[in-house]
C-alpha cells in the first residue's frame, strides 16, 4: 500500500539498515526509495529538545511485514518509501538549504557569484555530489563567495550542521541538467585498470552499466562475461573511479567489456529498469518466497508486486507436474543484485520492474512502430497532442508534444493572432479528430510562452511552451517524449518520423486520422543549398527525401519530429516551415530542439 504523507513526531522502532544524513525528511524519503532494501525511515529534524549530533539523521529501515511499531518522539518525522507507490519518482533535488553545511570531502574550492553558479559547477563536475556555498554575508572575509564541491562514498553528506550565511544543495545530474559528455559506447575486449569502489554480480554489461550509473561513486565499469576464463570472476561487475574522471588506461582482455556511467544523460535512457529475461541463468540470493507460476513473465509480475522482491529465478514445470506451473523463486540481497549468477541449470531469471518508475517516464517502451502505411494506430505516438482553437469556431490549429506533466512543446508561429490562452484546448491520447466532441475532456492552457527572439518561422526561434491548467496523468495513450541530451549533439538519428493531422498535399484539408511518415535527416549544409534565400542556422534541423513525396504540411506545425535512439524516442525537431509540401529537393525545416534544451528547462522549472 502506498503511503505518501509524513508522520510528524513519530519514530519507527527497530528495523535499522543504515543511517545517512539528509537536509530534510522529504529527501530522506527519496534516499529510502532509491535504497535497495529500505521500506520505511525515521528522520530527525533540528530541535532544541534533540541532541544536535542527531539532527538531520535519516535512519533507513526494513521490515518483513512492511511496517514497524510507532513511537512518539518530538522532532522525529517518519514515513514510507515510494517503492510501494506506482507514481513517477525522481532523485532530482533542486532545493537549496539555507544555513546548512553539508559535510563531505571538500575536493574543490573556488569563487562563485551565486549559489546557482556553485550548483551549476557541481552539476558539471564529474565527482560532485553536493556543495556548500558561503554567501557574501558570511562572517569570514576570505571565505565569502567560496563554492565548495563535495563528494562522499554514499552520495549523501557524512554530517549536516547549522552554519549561518551558507547555503547547500545537491548536484543536478539526476535532473538531466549536466553538460558533461555522455559516453554511451561499450568497449568489447577491454578492461579499465583503475580503483574499484564496489563490485556486484550482473547478467550482462548493460545491467552492469546501469548499476554503475545509479551508484553515486561509479564513473566507469568493467564487466567480466560468463565466458571469462577465471570462473570466480564470471558475471562480475567492477564499479570504478579515478581522479581525472576517466580511465587511466585501457587493457585488452578477451571476454571483458567496459563502459561509462551514464549519470550525465540518464534522463534519456532507462537506468533502474532491467526488463530483460536471462535464459538458462540462475540468480542466487536470499529467498523471500517460492510461488507457483505459469511462466517467467508471470514470475516477474509476482516479483514486481512483492515490494521486497528484487530479482527472481523461474524454473519451468517438468512435463505434467503442478498443472504446468513452474516454481518462481522471489529473492533479495543487501545491494539489489544477485549474490552469484549460475548458468546451465535451466532457470530463467530477471529483475523486479518496480524500479522502472524511477526512470524518466519518457523512456518507457511504447507500442512497436507499425511498418508501412501512413495512418497511425492508437498509442503509437503517445506524446502527440492536437491543439485546438475555439475562436471563431473550434478547429485543429497545430500539433504539439507532451514533454512534462504540465507542459506541451510546440511552434511559436502557431500563435499568430491568438490573443489569449483561454481560447486554446489541448487534446491528448487522440487518434482521430472525429473523437473530439463537446464533452471530450481537454486541458486548458494557463500560459503561452513564446521564445522572446521569435519573429517569424523562417528566421528561427520557432518554439513555444504551453503550460497546462491541470496535470496530465500518464497512461499508454498519453505520455511524454524525452528531450534530446545536450551531450548527444554528435548522435546521428536514423529512425525519424514526422506525425500530424495536417494536409497530405498543399491544397487539402486537416486529416481525421493521425498521419505518420518516416523521413531521413538532411545535413544543414545540404539544406542550405536547397534554401539559398534563407539562412539555415544550427538552431534548425532539416529532414526530407531528395525526391520529395513525404513531408510535414499545413496543420502539422508544432508537432514532433520524433527520432528513436538507443530504444528511446527523442523530440529532435518541431515542425516549423518549408517551401510547399513534400517538394523535390525542398526538405522540411524543423526547430532543432537540442539547441533549446536550456531554454525549455529554464521556463519549465521557473518557480
Amino acid at each position: 500500500e502506498c503511503v505518501t504523507q509524513l508522520l510528524k513526531d513519530t519514530c519507527f522502532e527497530g528495523g535499522d539498515i543504515t543511517t545517512v544524513f539528509t537536509p530534510s525528511a522529504k529527501y530522506c524519503q527519496v534516499v529510502c526509495t532509491y535504497h535497495p532494501r529500505c521500506l520505511l525511515f525515521t528522520f530527525t529534524a533540528e530541535s532544541p529538545s534533540e541532541d544536535p549530533t542527531r539532527w538531520f539523521t535519516c535512519v533507513l529501515k526494513d521490515s518483513v511485514t512492511e511496517t514497524l511499531p510507532r513511537v512518539n518522539r518530538t522532532a522525529a518525522i517518519s514515513g514510507y518509501s515510494f517503492k510501494q507507490c506506482s507514481h513517477q519518482i525522481s532523485a532530482c533535488n533542486k532545493d537549496i538549504y539555507v544555513d546548512l553545511d553539508m559535510k563531505g570531502i571538500n575536493y574543490n574550492s573556488s569563487v562563485a557569484k551565486s549559489a546557482q553558479e556553485c550548483q551549476e559547477r557541481c552539476t558539471d563536475d564529474v565527482h560532485c555530489h553536493f556543495f556548500t556555498y558561503a554567501t557574501r554575508q558570511f562572517p569570514s572575509l576570505e571565505h565569502r563567495n567560496i563554492c565548495l564541491l563535495k563528494h562522499t562514498q554514499t552520495g549523501t553528506p557524512t554530517r549536516i550542521t547549522k552554519l549561518d550565511k551558507v547555503v547547500s544543495g545537491f548536484s543536478l545530474k539526476s535532473c538531466a541538467l549536466s553538460n558533461l559528455a555522455c559516453i554511451r559506447d561499450i568497449f568489447p575486449n577491454t578492461v579499465f585498470a583503475d580503483s574499484n569502489i564496489d563490485s556486484v554480480m550482473a547478467p550482462d554489461a548493460f545491467v552492469c552499466g546501469r548499476i554503475c550509473t545509479h551508484h553515486p561513486g561509479c564513473l566507469f565499469f568493467t564487466f567480466f562475461s560468463q565466458e571469462w576464463p577465471k570462473e570466480s570472476q564470471r558475471n562480475l561487475c567492477l564499479l570504478k573511479t579515478s581522479e581525472s574522471g576517466l580511465p587511466s588506461t585501457r587493457i585488452k582482455k578477451s571476454k571483458a567489456l567496459s563502459g561509462f556511467s551514464l549519470q550525465s544523460c540518464r534522463h534519456s535512457i532507462p537506468v533502474f529498469c532491467h526488463s530483460s529475461f536471462y535464459h538458462d541463468t540462475d540468480f542466487l540470493g536470499e529467498e523471500l518466497d517460492i510461488v507457483a507460476a505459469k511462466s517467467h513473465e508471470a514470475c516477474q509480475k509476482l516479483c514486481t508486486n512483492a515490494v521486497r522482491c528484487q530479482f527472481f529465478t523461474y524454473t519451468p514445470a517438468q512435463a505434467s507436474c503442478n498443472e504446468g506451473k513452474g516454481k518462481c523463486y522471489l529473492k533479495l540481497s543487501s545491494n539489489g543484485s544477485p549474490t552469484k549468477i549460475l548458468h546451465g541449470r535451466g532457470g530463467i531469471s530477471g529483475y523486479t520492474l518496480r524500479l522502472c518508475k524511477m526512470d524518466n517516464e519518457c523512456t518507457t517502451k511504447i507500442k512497436p512502430r507499425i511498418v508501412g502505411g501512413t495512418a497511425s494506430v492508437r498509442g503509437e505516438w503517445p506524446w502527440q497532442v492536437t491543439l485546438h482553437t475555439t475562436s471563431p469556431t473550434q478547429r485543429h490549429l497545430c500539433g504539439g508534444s507532451i514533454i512534462g506533466n504540465q507542459w506541451i512543446l510546440t511552434a511559436a508561429h502557431c500563435f499568430y493572432g491568438v490573443e489569449s490562452p483561454k481560447i486554446l484546448r489541448v487534446y491528448s491520447g487522440i487518434l482521430n479528430q472525429s473523437e473530439i466532441k463537446e464533452d471530450t475532456s481537454f486541458f486548458g492552457v494557463q500560459e503561452i510562452i513564446i521564445h522572446d527572439q521569435y519573429k517569424m518561422a523562417e528566421s528561427g526561434y520557432d518554439i513555444a511552451l504551453l503550460k497546462l491548467e491541470t496535470t496530465v496523468n500518464y497512461t499508454d495513450s498519453q505520455r511524454p517524449i524525452c528531450l534530446p541530451s545536450k551531450g548527444d549533439r554528435n548522435v546521428i538519428y536514423t529512425d525519424c518520423w514526422v506525425t500530424g493531422w495536417g494536409y497530405r498535399k498543399l491544397r487539402d484539408k486537416i486529416q481525421n486520422t493521425l498521419q505518420k511518415a518516416k523521413i531521413p535527416l538532411v545535413t544543414n549544409e545540404e539544406c542550405q543549398k536547397r534554401y539559398r534565400g534563407h539562412k539555415i542556422t544550427h538552431k534548425m534541423i532539416c529532414a526530407g527525401y531528395r525526391e520529395g513525396g513525404k513531408d510535414a504540411c499545413k496543420g502539422d506545425s508544432g508537432g514532433p519530429l520524433s527520432c528513436k535512439h538507443n530504444e528511446v524516442w527523442h523530440l529532435v525537431g518541431i515542425t516549423s516551415w518549408g517551401e510547399g509540401c513534400a517538394q523535390r529537393e525542398r526538405p522540411g525545416v524543423y526547430t532543432n530542439v537540442v539547441e533549446y534544451v536550456d531554454w525549455i528547462l529554464e521556463k519549465t522549472q521557473a518557480v
Epitope: A181, R250, I251, K252, I492
Partner: antibody
C-alpha cells in the same frame, strides 16, 4: 568501400598551429573509434591520439598531451586534429585510421604532411 | 608503458624465399599483437591481429605466431609485392606502441 581523406597539412613555424581534417566515407563513421598515427620522414609509426565513437573520451600519446586535441563531428563524418605549440619534432605524415575491435588500425587514409620549420 | 623491439631492422631475400621477422615486447602482452605492411609512399595495411589471425583479404602466405613477449611474422614464398617495411604493434594497452620497423628488400 572505406575511404579516409586527410587534409590541412602544410608548412608551419615552430609554436604555430594547424588543424587537420579527415573526411570518412563508405562506413558508419559514428560506430567507429578513430585515431591519428604519424610517421616522421624515414622513421617508424607513432600513435598520436584516439577518440571513441561518441566523442566523449580522448586519449593522447605523452609526446602531444596538452598541445594536440582530437575531435570528431559525426554529422559530418569528419575527424579533426587541432595541433598547437608545434615543434620541429612534430614534422611527419599524419594518417587518420579506424581503430577496430581487433585493437588494430583497420583502415588508413593516404596521409597529409605537416612540416614544422622556421 | 610497453616498448616494442623488432629484429632485424632490415632483411634481404629473393622471390620464393621464406622470411621470418621477430618482435619482442618489454612485458607480457598475451597474444595481443598486430602486424602491418607499408609499401613505399603508401599508408600501412593491417595484415595480422591477435598475433595469428589473418585480416580478411590478406594472402595465406602471411602467418603470425607467439605469445607473451616474443612474436614472429613469417612470409612463405615471397612475392614481388611483399618487399616493403613491416611493423608490429602491441594491442595490449594504451598508449599503443609500434616496433621500429623491418625493411624487407630484394637481394
Amino acid at each position: 568501400e572505406v575511404q579516409l581523406l586527410e587534409s590541412g597539412g602544410g608548412l608551419v613555424q615552430p609554436g604555430g598551429s594547424l588543424r587537420l581534417s579527415c573526411a570518412a566515407s563508405g562506413f558508419t563513421f559514428s560506430d567507429y573509434e578513430m585515431a591519428w598515427v604519424r610517421q616522421a620522414p624515414g622513421k617508424g609509426l607513432e600513435w598520436v591520439s584516439s577518440i571513441v565513437p561518441s566523442g566523449g573520451w580522448t586519449l593522447y600519446a605523452d609526446s602531444v598531451k596538452g598541445r594536440f586535441t582530437i575531435s570528431r563531428d559525426n554529422s559530418k563524418n569528419t575527424l579533426y586534429l587541432q595541433m598547437n605549440s608545434l615543434r620541429a619534432e612534430d614534422t611527419a605524415v599524419y594518417y587518420c585510421a579506424t581503430w577496430g575491435d581487433s585493437w588494430g588500425f583497420d583502415f588508413w587514409g593516404q596521409g597529409t604532411l605537416v612540416t614544422v620549420s622556421s | 608503458d610497453i616498448q616494442m623491439t623488432q629484429s632485424p631492422s632490415s632483411v634481404s631475400a629473393s622471390v620464393g624465399d621464406r622470411v621470418t621477422i621477430t618482435c619482442r615486447a618489454s612485458q607480457g602482452i598475451s597474444s595481443w599483437l598486430a602486424w602491418y605492411q607499408q609499401r613505399p609512399g603508401k599508408a600501412p595495411k593491417l595484415l595480422i591481429y591477435d598475433a595469428s589471425t589473418l585480416q580478411s583479404g590478406v594472402p595465406s602466405r602471411f602467418s603470425g605466431s607467439g605469445s607473451g613477449t616474443d612474436f614472429t611474422l613469417t612470409i612463405n614464398s615471397l612475392q614481388p609485392e611483399d618487399f616493403a617495411t613491416y611493423y608490429c604493434q602491441q594491442a595490449d594497452s594504451f598508449p599503443i606502441a609500434f616496433g621500429q620497423g623491418t625493411r624487407l628488400e630484394i637481394k
